[in-house]
């Protein structure tokens, strides 16, 4: 009896693992071996396929072979007892192409309100994605396990905290990795889950805010406690994308350690230009807070945002504030290259009760004013950008006198 | 193969100094943290310090502060523990460990052996 | 500092048995706690990171537990090989610090 070729190959790449599946063509025949031929581009011969040759089963790994994985290859198969099948040749195809990323390693760490998570390459140097290693970004579903509202978070890199998290909860959370330049989104890790610890005496600070004071970077924050003792550290943000790092060197401001404030106040030539991050703890001398939530701080955006300046002209109902752009010292004007939206905050001088106005407009009516009443009026600027929401420092507030009655004009 | 090398045995008087080093193979130590550890006989161990190779910054534990001064030398991958003033209660082993902020102190030196002794 | 105290400075166990060394922080260090096993003359050998994480090539024997102040590394069906003190690390905070260490004694 003839053998029939089997039918309907397919091949699997996860990574740098190889796996080849078909059908049997004949289930009644028994004993029946498999052998694989695989032939590269612009090559005539065929050469066997190390790993797939007399397999009695539907299914083999020729992870072994050292492919150019750029490099387009043929397959061939043929069943074999006494005397063999045809060939059947399956479809060329170019490895890189085919390849699915496998699920990542992940790992974790519990705070009481935040969980680290560490994720490398499920294949550790693989040959697949050497050239893409430094693109891959990740993503991940995170729930509660007592729930199961799962939430989605895009576009991390290889360490990533998640904060506002519950103590003493139990997180579950996967991650798939993907190659953005290569449209290639990869396989779910398994399900990993770890539980928060207990609630620690000491809270992180909160709301931490830069601005610019004169030649100097002031950095606040909130805590909930007096009698306390911060220290401030500092990182490149972009050692946040690099993947094989998983030791972020945090630096240490030096006019920042040990302060006892909710402040502190260091040079600008502290940070030479870029994106950095920062970070703050305090501790009470026995415990130590966590470390606070990380702030990306861009010394370009911050050097230059100012508080703007601002002349009012004053009526009997209203003021009319012309915003100009700030000085820097030796009185010349910032350019400022980004587009801004400006708060405008005004009241009456005898009163505590302010109102605003945000406004995009450098030219901006404040209505509804008494005649002849003080009215005070301060000013920042906000970066429109969502990226870099950041906003300057107050001015001054300047007070004017509203005129009299009868002024319209 | 991954390694950390330290110097071999010191045996020295009271009052003096001693520099031990530690080389590390497989690796480069610009990439982690060197950290040193004291361990006397029978006794638990004791963290010293660790030095960031990259830029020389130091931490101490306070008890150390001023008897240990932790350096290193990137060109020839060695980090060093100098300590001064020897006293008896320096009579210790000493252990550099590697640390690269995710598997904690995965590598460690075989451990130098110092005497202070007159 | 944190004090790291494994209160048990010596534990007695036979071949086969499962014995857990526990070890307890004076504050919240979340998950950073390590543990190592140090024989005689050697250099202390690394078995678990992040309370629970083994280092390759360690027997899946050794399993590590805990969060916040309370850690365990438990070592079920106890070999002769596992003769040795144990040692808990804390790497929250600087300075870092490590237990008294227990000692295991085979019967």
């Known amino acids: 009896k003839n053998l029939k070729s089997p039918q309907k190959v397919e091949v699997d790449i996860i990574d740098d693992n190889f796996i080849l599946r078909w059908n049997r063509s004949d289930e009644s025949v028994g004993n029946v071996t498999f052998s694989f031929d695989y032939q590269k581009t612009g090559m005539d011969n065929w050469i066997k396929l190390s790993g797939c040759q007399n397999i009695t089963s539907t299914k083999c790994n020729f992870s072994s072979l050292k492919l150019n994985v750029y490099e387009e290859i043929k397959l061939r198969i043929r069943a074999e007892k006494e005397n063999t099948s045809s060939w059947y040749e399956v479809d060329s195809f170019t490895p890189f192409r085919k390849a699915q990323i496998g699920p990542p390693e992940v790992h974790l760490e519990a705070e009481d309100k935040a969980i680290v998570i560490h994720i490398s390459p499920g294949t550790k140097d693989s040959v697949m994605w050497a050239l893409d290693g430094l693109s891959f970004t990740y993503s991940l579903v995170i729930w509660k396990n007592s729930s199961g509202v799962e939430e989605r978070i895009e576009n991390i890199y290889s360490r990533h905290k998640i904060y506002k998290l519950s103590p003493e909860t139990t997180y579950c959370l996967k991650v798939k990795a993907a190659l953005l330049t290569s449209w290639k989104i990869g396989v779910y890790s398994p399900v990993h889950c770890i539980k928060t610890t207990v609630e620690n005496e000491l809270p992180p600070p909160e709301n931490i805010e830069v601005s610019v004071q004169n030649q100097n970077y002031v950095l606040k924050w909130d805590y909930t406690y007096a009698n306390m003792t911060f220290q401030v550290q500092w990182l490149h943000a972009f050692l946040k994308r690099n993947p094989g790092n998983h030791l972020y060197k945090w630096k240490q401001i030096p006019d920042c350690e040990n302060v006892k404030t909710t402040q502190c106040v260091f040079p600008q030539n502290v940070f030479q230009k870029g994106i950095y991050l920062l970070r703050v703890q305090a501790s009470d001398g026995n415990n130590t807070s966590f470390w606070s939530e990380e702030i990306k701080f861009d010394t370009e955006i911050q050097a230059f945002l100012l508080p703007p300046v601002f002349n009012i002209r004053s009526l009997s109902d209203s003021f009319h504030i012309y915003i100009g752009a700030p000085k820097q010292s030796g009185n010349t004007p910032v350019i400022q290259d980004y587009p801004l939206i400006y708060e405008i905050i005004f009241w009456e001088n005898t009163s505590n009760a302010e109102r605003k106005i945000i406004e995009k407009k450098t030219d901006v009516t404040v209505p509804n004013l008494k005649p002849l009443t003080v009215y005070c009026v301060k000013a920042r600027a906000h970066t429109m950008d969502e990226k870099l929401n950041k906003s300057s420092v107050f001015s001054d507030a300047v007070c004017e006198k509203t005129k009299p009655g009868n002024t319209s004009k | 193969e991954v390694q950390l090398q330290q110097s071999g045995a010191e045996l020295v008087k009271p009052g003096a100094s001693v520099k031990v080093s530690c080389t590390g193979s497989?690796?480069?130590?610009?990439?982690?943290?060197i950290h040193w550890v004291k361990q006397r006989t029978e006794q638990g161990l004791e963290w010293i310090g660790r030095?960031?190779?990259?830029?020389?910054?130091?931490k101490y534990a306070p008890k150390f502060q001023g008897k240990a001064t932790i350096t290193s030398d990137t060109s020839s991958n060695t980090a060093y523990l100098q300590l001064s003033s020897l006293t008896s209660g320096d009579t210790a082993v000493y252990f550099c460990a590697r640390y690269d902020g995710y598997y904690c102190f995965d590598y460690w030196g075989q451990g130098t052996t110092l005497t202070v002794s007159s | 500092d944190i004090v790291m105290t494994q209160s048990q400075k010596f534990m007695s166990t036979s071949v086969g048995d499962r014995v857990s060394v526990t070890c307890k922080a004076s504050q919240n260090v979340g998950t950073n706690v390590a543990w190592y096993q140090q024989k005689p003359g050697q250099s202390p050998k690394p078995l678990i990171y992040?309370?629970?994480y083994r280092y390759s090539g360690v027997p899946d024997r050794f399993t590590g537990s805990g969060s916040g102040t309370d850690f365990t590394l438990t070592i079920s069906n106890v070999q002769s090989a596992d003769l040795a003190a144990y040692f808990c690390q804390q790497y929250n905070n600087y300075p870092y610090t490590f237990g008294g260490g227990t000692r295991l004694e085979i019967k």
């Open positions: 992040s309370t629970s």
């Open positions: 497989g690796f480069n130590i610009k990439d982690y943290y």
């Open positions: 030095i960031d190779p990259e830029d020389g910054e130091t």
